[in-house]
């Protein structure tokens, strides 16, 4: 009786079940009750992940320099490119289709954390006690200077863009 | 066809503003950079800033405020606002396409700033 | 901000000759670095990009060489053609979100 499921790696065609091509090459004819499946490696800049009935392999992803893509990591008959972009910009998508620039943290805020290929500029307010004065995208939250520890007291708060203003202490006692 | 067309340059006082534009044609500003290079009149070429495909913009440490780059997707266009126009701005405004080097260049667009 | 020095300002040579121009960085910029040649009157073409990847549409007698802040612009063989003014121009990105395209002076191309 002809099978309705077959094994692990294997496929149904024909009432019969034949034997998957392994990931990195592809279908050239399937089994037959006398001969195995063909199977062809993949061509230059070319893959397949997976095991499968593919009759055609995929073309490995073109990291576009005109997008400000490079490739990361080159693919292999068995896995496809991986592109980000080129340094000071980063991947609008997981998928890595195009770049953009970083972007800075503004006066107020610190970096959080710092761009990547893959991730933009992480930008948090400086809470009370910090401050940041530089639209910058590697800078964090200043603290505050601390006119004690100098022997000074504070002339002017400071705020989340400005520094406190230290001055000397008022000598003049009642 | 792929291709940049700048235009709005003329003649401008000192202290004057202009705003010059760049058409693009075959592709989109919401997949591509454009920059905008200047070039002086018998001088070498000179960056003025870039706008990434999502909108966020860069510049020359020189241009201090004075310029602004913008874009409306709509119309597949770029523009340079030009403020506080000086004498020494006169070029040859180029839109030009790419991120870290320039594959595509418009024909450019002349600003000339005297009084 | 990057400084690019391009040498020589001016060079005269012959058809069939092999030219060499240089351009150095202020400081390394890995190979972030391209080549345009200009015809008067027009705009800039690209040549090179990432200090030795030929643009497309590009002879195979141009090459570029070169990383980190010493680059060399070749043609292997001057055609009429290739009389122009050639420029450098560097990417650096300071990491403090600060971009930066900075063009060598150029080298004019002259028949001897």
């Known amino acids: 009786e002809p099978p309705t499921a077959c094994r692990e790696k294997q496929y149904l065609i024909n009432s019969q079940c034949c034997s998957l091509c392994q990931p990195g090459q592809k279908l050239v004819s399937d089994c037959t009750e006398f001969t195995e499946t063909e199977c062809l490696p993949c061509g230059e800049s070319e893959f397949l992940d997976t095991w499968n009935r593919e009759t055609h392999c995929h073309q490995h992803k073109y990291c576009d320099p005109n997008l400000g893509l490079r490739v990361q990591q080159k693919g292999t008959s068995e896995t496809d490119t991986i592109c980000t972009c080129e340094e000071g910009w980063h991947c609008t998508s997981e998928a890595c289709e195009s770049c953009v620039l970083h972007r800075s943290c503004s006066p107020g805020f610190g970096v959080k954390q710092i761009a990547t290929g893959v991730s933009d500029t992480i930008c948090e307010p400086c809470p009370v006690g910090f401050f940041s004065n530089v639209s910058s995208a590697f800078e964090k939250c200043h603290p505050w200077t601390s006119c004690e520890t100098k022997d000074l007291v504070v002339q002017q708060a400071g705020t989340n863009k400005t520094d406190v203003v230290c001055g000397p202490q008022d000598r003049l006692r009642a | 066809e792929v291709q940049l067309v700048e235009s709005g340059g003329g003649l401008i006082q000192p202290g004057g503003s202009l705003r010059l534009s760049c058409a693009v044609s075959?592709?989109?500003?919401?997949?591509?950079?454009v920059s905008w290079v200047r070039q002086a009149p018998g001088k070498g070429l000179e960056w003025v800033g870039i706008?990434?495909?999502?909108?966020?913009?860069a510049y020359a440490s020189w241009v201090k405020g004075r310029f602004t780059i913008s874009r409306d997707n709509s119309k597949n266009t770029l523009y340079l606002q030009m403020n506080s126009l000086r004498a020494e701005d006169t070029a040859v405004y180029y839109c030009?396409?790419?991120?870290?080097?320039?594959?595509?260049w418009g024909q450019g667009t002349l600003v000339t700033v005297s009084s | 901000d990057i400084v690019m020095t391009q040498s020589p300002s001016t060079l005269s040579a012959s058809v069939g000759d092999r030219v060499t121009i240089t351009c150095q960085a202020s400081?390394?910029?890995?190979?972030?670095l391209s080549w345009y040649q200009q015809k008067p009157g027009k705009a800039p073409k690209l040549l090179i990009y990432?200090?030795?990847d030929l643009a497309s549409g590009v002879p195979s007698r141009f090459s570029g060489s070169g990383s980190g802040t010493e680059f060399t612009l070749t043609i292997s063989s001057l055609q009429p053609d290739d009389f122009a003014t050639y420029y450098c121009?560097?990417?650096?990105?300071?990491?403090?979100?600060?971009?930066?395209?900075?063009f060598g002076g150029g080298t004019k191309v002259e028949i001897k």
């Open positions: 030009a396409r790419g991120v870290t080097f320039f594959g595509l």
């Open positions: 075959g592709f989109s500003l919401s997949t591509y950079a």
């Open positions: 706008i990434d495909s999502g909108g966020g913009t």
């Open positions: 400081q390394s910029i890995s190979n972030y």
């Open positions: 990432r200090a030795s």
């Open positions: 121009q560097a990417y650096y990105y300071s990491g403090g979100g600060s971009y930066d395209y900075a």
